[in-house]
Structure formats: structure tokens, C-alpha cells
Interface confidence: low
């Protein structure tokens, strides 16, 4: 999916105001010096690129965050702010139904979510300083 | 490793044309505003062009408005400067310069080639 | 068109503290960048948006900008340290990039 064509402001708006809150409560007992960050974006349409995989395509290690909160928030931001975005993810979200899986938090999804983290505080720099 | 390699560069006279190309590897190209910097022989450091990351957008110093070009091409991970109607004060060193792409706001230089040297001389 | 000016040498000895300054009308309310230039080399970034620094750049080095004056500063000074530090910014009146004139770090 190409998401260029974003409402970014909103999308910002909806990390700022939930998603954010539920990726810390996440992450809570975790120091924040644990996980270097390894992952980066240098644009906006680029950061959801990588939200995205990271946030929903299960890696080796980490096959549950897809239903945490965090999660499901962040796709219906997705959903209402990118044209065209749900229609693109129906098959996944059916073939994710067929795969679920008993919660675990690992130290893998401690890490991914580390990383998730940092994406959005990039997603999120100011553009310019206040004049 | 990432890396981004000018080539292009000579002597050329006044008036003459020269191309200019950057080679990039080792990171997303297509996701990164691109920019020249130029630095003549003993002085500072001059900023030239940028064209964003989907090339949607160019920005020229005013030394060389209308006489230069820039452009990229993603798919092969190549930017370049066409120079028309070259001076002698156009004589520097020209840096291809990458930047995180941001709306309207410029980012931080963070990744340089090592430069090529144009002379522009009689 | 906006401009920044640098002091054009600054001389300081090993184990001090090197104080540099970029002025700019405002300048506080953009997003300044430094560079390090040794001689016959590229320009390497070593402080970022006012004041943060890429992993590689040792903690020495710092940065601060308000008012009209953007700061680098470099502590416990090392001979490695001497070479030129330009300032940068985005002028987004003109949709321009904007060096300052460069300032040459001497270690005594």
C-alpha cells in the first residue's frame, strides 16, 4: 500500500492522543535504554511503511501483536486516514483470524515494540519549529 | 554500506555544459530528499539544489537558477546536475548530498559523497 | 536572503572547552545543524536539530540555539577535534538552504 495519500495530521493526532498511551502500557517494566533502535523512516509515507510491517506482519519470535490494543488502534487510523487502505488488507486480516495464537509477550515483541516506538516519535518530528 | 559516489566532473570553459551524476547504494534511495552542495577552492560550503524524494519538487540557489538542473531517477538510484552556461565562479568541489525528506522542512545532511572536482576555465 | 555568521577562528587548548557561534535573525526559531570539514575530506555531521548528536559523534560535542545565536560546543578539546564547523539551516521563506561561512578550529 502507497501511503502518500494520508491524512497525516490526523494520523498524528490519533497516535498522540491513544496510540502512544497503549504502546507504553505495553512496554511498562521495560527500561527504555533495553532496545537500540535499529529501525528508521525518513518520511512520513515511509514511517507507515514500516509501522505497518512492524505492527502486523509476524516475525520469527513476535506472532501476537497484531491484537493488542496499540494494534488494532493504529489500523483504524490507518483505515479511516489512507484511501483505499482497508480494502487492501482484508485478505490479511482473514488469514490472521485462521493463525491465532495464544498472547505471549516475548522479549522479541518487547524489542518490536521498542522499535514501533521509535518510528512513531520520527513519524511524528516537527516539521518546523513554531515561527 | 551506504555510500554515494559523484562522478561527471573536469575542466569545461565558459559557456560550455557538464553533467553530473551520484551513485547511490546501501539504503532507500526513493526515500530521501537529494541535494548538491558545492565548495570552491579555499572557501565555504555552498548549497546548490535539492529535489525531493519522489522528485515532485526542486529548489535552486539563486547563483544558479535557470542555469542548472537537477534530477533523479529511482529506479536506478542515480541523481544528477545538468549545468548549462557554466562560469568561472562555478569552479568548486560538488558534494551529492543525501537528507531525510520532510514536508517543507529540510533535514539534516547526514550522508555525503566525497565530491567532484569541476573547473570551469579558458 | 537569510544569513548566518560564524566567527571565522576560534583557538583553544587541548582538554578546554571550544565555544562556536552561529547568528542569524531569529535563529532560535529554526532548526540548526553543524558540520566538521577536516582538510581534503567531506563534511560530516556531528549535531543535529539544535542539539542532538548521530550515534557515531563522541558526547564531547553539543549544541544549544536561542534567541539570535546558535551554539556548538566541543569539551575536552582534542587535537583530532581541529578543522573547520559550518552551521546550517532551512530558510523556508525562500525554500533555500543556508551555510554559514565556515569557522576554523584551532587546537594550540
Known amino acids: 500500500y502507497d501511503f502518500t495519500n494520508c491524512d497525516f495530521e490526523k494520523i498524528k493526532a490519533a497516535y498522540l492522543s491513544t496510540i502512544s498511551k497503549d504502546l507504553i502500557t505495553y512496554m511498562s517494566g521495560t527500561k527504555s535504554t533495553e532496545f537500540n533502535n535499529t529501525v528508521s523512516c525518513s518520511n512520513r509515507p515511509h514511517c507507515l511503511t514500516e509501522i505497518q510491517s512492524l505492527t502486523f506482519n509476524p516475525t520469527a519470535g513476535c506472532a501476537s501483536l497484531a491484537k493488542e490494543m496499540f494494534a488494532m488502534k493504529t489500523k483504524a487510523a490507518l483505515a479511516i486516514w489512507c484511501p483505499g487502505y482497508s480494502e487492501t488488507q482484508i485478505n490479511a486480516t482473514q488469514a490472521m483470524k485462521k493463525r491465532r495464537k495464544r498472547k505471549v509477550t516475548t522479549n522479541k515483541c518487547l524489542e518490536q515494540v521498542s522499535q514501533l516506538q521509535g518510528l512513531w516519535r520520527r513519524f511524528n518530528r516537527p516539521l518546523l519549529k513554531q515561527q | 554500506q551506504m555510500q554515494l559516489v559523484e562522478s561527471g566532473g573536469g575542466v569545461v570553459q565558459p559557456g560550455r555544459s557538464l553533467r553530473l551524476s551520484c551513485a547511490a547504494s546501501g539504503f532507500a534511495f526513493r526515500t530521501y530528499g537529494m541535494h548538491w552542495v558545492r565548495q570552491a577552492p579555499g572557501k565555504g560550503l555552498e548549497w546548490v539544489a535539492v529535489i525531493w524524494y519522489d522528485g515532485s519538487a526542486t529548489h535552486y540557489a539563486d547563483s544558479v537558477k535557470g542555469r542548472f538542473t537537477i534530477t533523479r531517477d529511482n529506479s536506478k538510484n542515480t541523481l544528477n546536475l545538468q549545468m548549462n552556461s557554466l562560469r568561472a565562479e562555478d569552479t568548486a568541489v560538488y558534494y551529492c548530498?543525501?537528507?531525510?525528506?520532510?514536508?517543507?522542512?529540510?533535514?539534516?545532511?547526514?550522508?555525503w559523497g566525497q565530491g567532484t572536482m569541476v573547473t570551469v576555465s579558458s | 536572503s537569510y544569513v548566518l555568521t560564524q566567527p571565522p577562528s576560534v583557538s583553544v587548548a587541548p582538554g578546554q572547552t571550544a565555544t562556536i557561534t552561529c547568528g542569524g535573525n531569529l535563529i532560535g526559531s529554526k532548526l540548526v545543524h553543524w558540520y566538521q570539514q577536516k582538510p581534503g575530506q567531506a563534511p560530516v555531521l556531528v549535531v543535529y536539530?539544535?542539539?542532538d548528536r548521530p550515534s557515531r559523534i563522541p558526547e564531547r560535542f553539543s549544541g544549544s540555539n536561542i534567541g539570535n545565536t546558535a551554539t556548538l560546543t566541543i569539551s575536552r578539546v582534542e587535537a583530532g577535534d581541529e578543522a573547520d564547523y559550518y552551521c546550517q539551516v532551512w530558510d523556508h521563506s525562500s525554500d533555500h538552504v543556508v551555510f554559514g561561512g565556515g569557522t576554523k578550529l584551532t587546537v594550540l
Open positions: 536539530d539544535d542539539s
Open positions: 548530498v543525501r537528507a531525510p525528506q520532510w514536508y517543507l522542512s529540510a533535514e539534516a545532511f547526514d550522508l
